[in-house]
């Protein structure tokens, strides 16, 4: 699921991976526009073995994940696309 | 040329534990990610575990999460499956494959020649 | 979990012949899916990867076709090396073989 949050929390991630991950391990892509308390953009991914990790989301492989999952207008991806608003 | 040579396999009792050992050669060994795959005795494939390019990730089938272990050592170039609690059902030939980065897709595109796990009293 | 169903199960078929395998998976898979062939034996082979694109060394008659749930491998012209076990792969969630589809001479 990649999924955009508007949050009022300050930043999540204290270290970031630029180390990639195979779409097929991933979860869940939650991505935190900057802004309201945190001066950055940050990406965290959940994986299939349960763990988290915060990713840099200047990392060239995010950002071509992330295109190919904004390209694909399936709704039954195994990654799909929603947002989630500003309440 | 890629070459993956498995080794460890054997008979062993119920309970018991084996360990392979995969060596690889031809190829930059730490760029890749790497997996275990098993075939029961003329059955189909199934994955069994997968592991980053460090080691520091690692993935199982859920049917041996918990009694298998994939760990990796790069300066030897080695591949490893550690199998403790083995079940009759844990009988297979297991191979040790390369997984290929394609758009972000990781594909086994090289196999070893497989060793064979046999799990009996 | 995605299963992946894989027919038929065993196909008889002369030198000559086309031949269609089908693999069908559980959910949407987009292009993420790869065939292997493989002899007694020995260890799997890949052919085809990302659905259409043919493995470096894999002779023009094996193709690669699908997108989604539903793909198919077709080999135009059957010829004597090509009776063996095929497999498809999906790799979009974790790993799913298909059964597999048993090769066999007419």
């Known amino acids: 699921v990649l999924e955009v949050y508007y949050t009022s929390l300050r930043c999540r991630c204290v270290q970031e991976s630029s180390v990639f991950i195979p779409r097929r391990f991933i979860d869940r892509i939650q991505i935190l526009p900057r802004g309201n308390g945190c001066p950055r953009k940050e990406i965290i991914v959940w994986k299939k073995n349960k763990s988290i990790v915060c990713v840099d989301p200047q990392a060239e492989w995010i950002q071509r994940m992330m295109e190919v999952l904004r390209k694909r207008s399936s709704s039954t991806l195994p990654v799909p696309v929603f947002k989630r608003k500003i309440p | 040329e890629v070459q993956l040579v498995e080794s460890g396999g054997g008979l062993v009792q119920p309970g018991g534990s084996l360990r392979l050992s995969c060596a690889a050669s031809?190829?930059?060994?730490?760029?890749?990610?790497m997996a275990w795959v098993r075939q029961a005795p003329g059955k189909g494939l199934e994955w069994v575990a997968s592991i980053n390019y460090d080691g520091g990730d690692t993935y199982y089938r859920d049917s041996v999460k918990g009694r298998f272990t994939i760990s990796r050592d790069n300066a030897k170039n080695s591949l490893y499956l550690q199998m403790n609690s083995l079940r009759a059902e844990d009988t297979a030939v297991y191979y040790c494959a390369r997984e290929e980065d394609y758009d972000g897709s990781y594909v086994m595109d090289a196999w070893g020649q497989g060793t064979l796990v046999t799990v009996s009293s | 979990d995605i299963q992946m169903t894989q027919s038929p199960s065993s196909l008889s078929a002369s030198v000559g012949d086309r031949v269609t395998i089908t693999c069908k998976a559980s959910?949407?898979?987009?292009?993420?899916l790869t065939w292997y062939q493989q002899k007694p034996g020995k260890a799997p082979k890949r052919l085809i990867y990302?659905?259409?694109i043919l493995q470096t060394g894999i002779p023009s008659r094996f193709s690669g076709s699908g997108s989604g749930t539903e793909f198919t491998l077709t080999i135009s012209s059957l010829q004597p090396e090509d009776f063996a076990t095929y497999f498809c792969?999906?790799?979009?969630?974790?790993?799913?073989f298909g059964q597999g589809t048993k090769l066999e001479i007419k």
């Open positions: 792969l999906q790799q979009s969630s974790l790993y799913t």
């Open positions: 990302n659905t259409n």
């Open positions: 031809g190829f930059t060994f730490s760029d890749y990610y």
């Open positions: 959910q949407n898979i987009n292009k993420e």
